[in-house]
Amino acid sequence: APTSSSTKKTQLQLEHLLLDLQMILNGINNYKNPKLTRMLTFKFYMPKKATELKHLQCLEEELKPLEEVLNLAQSKNFHLRPRDLISNINVIVLELKGSETTFMCEYADETATIVEFLNRWITFCQSIISTLT
């Protein structure tokens, strides 16, 4: 059974992930982002189901395409370079989902814009955090 300290650690990691995703979303939704129209033409795979930490595998598999699309935006929209941002997210995701069990991600058929994709994973983080508090 998870201890209170491991639950607290998970919560903090999820909050960090949530902040990173929100920062990216705010950066691309910035009205000064002239590349938003182009960024919205790239489609992301969405999880069929995202209710547990193991489902973060679906996010992990989409981090490389996410980085490429973020590279289209002006770097001043973010505090960090996309490469560093994605690297940070990757570290958190790997810790959260664990590596003990190999989970095969199942994707929905509907694809999503970067905005829809980020919103979906923001909602996921918020949902898991609410169950931990």
Epitope: L40, K64, Y107, A108, E110
Partner: antibody, heavy 114, light 107 residues
Framework: EVQLQESGPGLVAPSQSLSITCTVS????????ISWIRQPPGKGLEWLGV???????NYNSGFMSRLSITKDNSKSQVFLKMNSLQTDDTAIYYC????????WGNGTLVTVSA | DIQVTQSPSSLSVSLGDRVTITCKAS??????LAWYQQKPGNAPRLLIS???SLETGVPSRFSGSGSGKDYTLTITSLQTEDVATYYC?????????FGGGTKLEIK
């Protein structure tokens, strides 16, 4: 069941315009992007353009000046309009539901001839 | 635009042989690749989506592999009904370009 059905004029005179309707069922156009693809007789497949769920469009640069894709979500219909047709526009025109798994219509043959 | 180079353009193979068709994109397409089979007079039939996912009803002798820029369609043991033209298509960047096709014939 997902279905896409193209309906076109069959024959178009050179320099005239082409209008094709793609009627879909089994899903909503608010959830899926729709592409148009064509295939001239005995040749390969050529992507023409896409209409996104929100109604925005993206066209193959080779057709930008004479292609228009629109839709009516409530009628579950997508429309392709191409101007200034020439004989080399003779092809089967397909509409395709984009997604992780693309779904194709059966296509409609358009012949450009006097 | 993302270019997709498909090879070979034609292939003559014996029944039961293993067949490999490759598609190389001009840049990383992150597994946004589909493989189609087309027989004369028919619309293309989706075999594989997401580079590796076999569609329902497609025989298990078909498989897709690859990542990054390089992708492969394999038919482990060619059957008579596999005679067709095969196309790949990338879905990462618009325009969603196709490979030039591979015409498969029986030797």
């Amino acid at each position: 069941e997902v279905q896409l059905q193209e309906s076109g004029p069959g024959l178009v005179a050179p320099s005239q315009s082409l209008s094709i309707t793609c009627t879909v069922s089994g899903f909503s156009l608010t959830n899926y992007d729709i592409s148009w693809i064509r295939q001239p007789p005995g040749k390969g497949l050529e992507w023409l353009g896409v209409i996104w769920t929100g109604g925005g469009t993206n066209y193959n640069s080779g057709f930008m000046s004479r292609l228009s894709i629109t839709k009516d979500n409530s009628k579950s219909q997508v429309f392709l309009k191409m101007n200034s047709l020439q004989t080399d526009d003779t092809a089967i025109y397909y509409c395709v539901r984009q997604g992780r798994t693309p779904y194709w219509g059966n296509g409609t043959l358009v012949t450009v001839s006097a | 635009d993302i270019q997709v180079t498909q090879s070979p353009s034609s292939l003559s193979v014996s029944l039961g042989d293993r067949v490999t068709i490759t598609c190389k994109a001009s840049k990383d397409i992150y597994n946004r690749l589909a493989w189609y089979q087309q027989k004369p007079g028919n619309a293309p039939r989706l075999l594989i989506s997401g580079a590796t996912s076999l569609e329902t009803g497609v025989p298990s002798r078909f498989s897709g592999s690859g990542s990054g820029k390089d992708y492969t369609l394999t038919i482990t043991s060619l059957q008579t009904e596999d005679v067709a033209t095969y196309y790949c298509q990338q879905f990462w960047g618009t325009p969603y370009t196709f490979g030039g096709g591979t015409k498969l014939e029986i030797k």
